[in-house]
Amino acid sequence: QSPIFGPQDVSSIEGNSVSITCYYPDTSVNRHTRKYWCRQGANGYCATLISSNGYLSKEYSGRASLINFPENSTFVINIAHLTQEDTGSYKCGLGTTNRGLFFDVSLEVSQVPEFPNDTHVYTKDIGRTVTIECRFKEGNAHSKKSLCKKRGEACEVVIDSTEYVDPSYKDRAILFMKGTSRDIFYVNISHLIPSDAGLYVCQAGEGPSADKNNADLQVLEPEPELLYKDLRSSVTFECDLGREVANDAKYLCRKNKETCDVIINTLGKRDPAFEGRILLTPRDDNGRFSVLITGLRKEDAGHYQCGAHSSGLPQEGWPVQAWQLFVNEESTIPNSRSVVKGVTGGSVAIVCPYNPKESSSLKYWCHWEADENGRCPVLVGTQALVQEGYEGRLALFDQPGSGAYTVILNQLTTQDSGFYWCLTDGDSRWRTTIELQVAEATKKPDLEVTPQNATAVIGETFTISCHYPCKFYSQEKYWCKWSNDGCHILPSHDEGARQSSVSCDQSSQIVSMTLNPVKKEDEGWYWCGVKEGQVYGETTAIYVAVEERTRGSPHINPTDANARAKDAPEEEAMESSVREDENKANLDPRLFADEREIQNAGDQAQENRASGNAGSAGGQSGSSK
């Protein structure tokens, strides 16, 4: 017996589509070998119609696809717009030739079934409304009108003009006439359910002079649209249920045995498994809406349904739309940390991957908010102003071509805890979700700036120092000036770099920045940070205020003041280093775009591809060291 398996018999009707699943043994060779679908000819030859190598025959052009699911050891052949000519014997198989492993499938495509000559066929989806048209002659204008449903030989009355309504059609069926029409009546049946399907007879009058019309009602289950998405990518369910449910609550649910569990609805219900990674967005006033889910997981695969009902829950007889979501584990989207931890007063550097082919796309970072349907207001972007409340503490560093950008948030508070999304205006699959957890700090921060009350005087020299611990000894230290479009790195001077790492003195590891002479435009936020290549680490921020020199105040160079506070030998060394390093700009993040790991403040190692915003220091006044 063949190790390939599938449906032996597939039957359908003209114009419809089929999805044929073929199972194969789970081996590495089978997962990667060619899959095919061919038609068996009378001569024994099996002519390929479609294969996983990309071949598509002329007769299948624009109406067929073959998709391999290696994780399920299956492949699916989808064929649309069937005609009776598609009836025949086929094989689904594996191998470089059509003589390899295969399974025989018989496909039968019939004509739409024939009914009595005057039968009108109505095809409607579940939950919709059908209007059955019933014609009669003038002689029956004042006679009783009715609609009955055929059950075997009997015909059971659904509704009639004496106001009788079958209990199973209560509140769903109405019989009416339009305007002054004297030869036609109508029956509306709303909230259609599968058992409503069948042959109906409408009648005006009684006995031999009665006028009768046949109506065949077909109630269709929604054919699920197949969605194929990569692990960690995102999916959007576009739901268009029609105007008649525009004012009802909307929902997206996931089928689970005989129920459909609501994931999100417009009444505020949300499944905790989707917390932080789901948004429901109304599209227009006609009831259209979309649901976006990011950070797809293997367990997200399954059958989904959107619908509308005042309860926000699935109800039989209300319109639905269906999808089957497949999540491909062989993803192009790199694995990045889903949880980032920080402490109050500290900082986090979050690496956001994006499609490397779209390096020029605009990058954004938004904060997911749980209210109602979920929303994600942008906090920072490559061409977006930093949101109010984040000035001086949030920046996006982009290194085009590296496949990632870094978002740094400092001066953390517990209110910063929550979910954040990385997104671009390019490939929408590359949306990643990060949960930020901010705990109360239990120790002093790793980076400390002195003086802490930083006020610089116009025209004078102002130096600010950043103290760092020995664990950052080998990392690159930098100062940058924060602005609405990023944090532009400045030339700076590392005091600790002259010592050997063996004799690292915790108290003397300093990177300083000098403004000389101070100008009014130097006022603002400055960051001191550490990084390794393009991997950003800890940062701290300080606001430098700039004021006019007050008359009569003695002119003291802050550098000298800082120097006097230290012991003399250190002062000598520092002075010489100032002269030696003067006007050297020795930080250029543009030179690096490598992939490394960094271990930060006890945090777990994080695989990052990060980048630096190579903003020039040209806007700064004087030379800074």
Partner: nanobody, 127 residues
């Protein structure tokens, strides 16, 4: 509550025919995949046949041992599943179970794919 009730089992002679039925309630029949399995004492349940619907297409699956002899069908209006068995052999003797998979997950031949099961009906084929 989901219920599957099999009927139609009995004792027949080899080469005779038999029709098994399964009445389903409490589940979306037309959007479920329905299967027949059988089990002989001391052995695992084995796949016999299955049927699934999508839109207006029907998919029928058979084990090689019954192909050409058994026909699976379903009536969506009555929520019933049938198994027409012709040319019965003594080795077809077993308890036959009806099963339902509303989610269309997994391999149609694997019993673990199906969430709901009937109590079974005994079919005995004497030679």
């Amino acid at each position: 509550e989901v219920q599957l009730v099999e009927s139609g089992g009995g004792v027949v002679q080899a080469e005779d025919s038999l029709r098994l039925s399964c009445a389903a309630s409490g589940l979306p029949f037309s959007s479920s995949r329905m299967g027949w399995f059988r089990q002989v004492p001391g052995k695992e349940r084995e796949f016999v046949a299955a049927i699934g619907w999508s839109g207006r297409s029907t998919y029928r699956y058979y084990d090689d041992s019954v192909k050409g002899r058994f026909t699976v069908s379903g009536d969506n209006a009555k929520n019933t599943l049938d198994l027409q068995m012709k040319g019965l052999k003594p080795e077809d003797t077993a308890v036959y179970y009806c099963a339902a998979d509303p989610n269309y997950y997994g391999d149609v031949r694997t019993s673990g794919t199906y969430q709901y099961w009937g109590q079974g009906t005994q079919v005995t084929v004497s030679s």
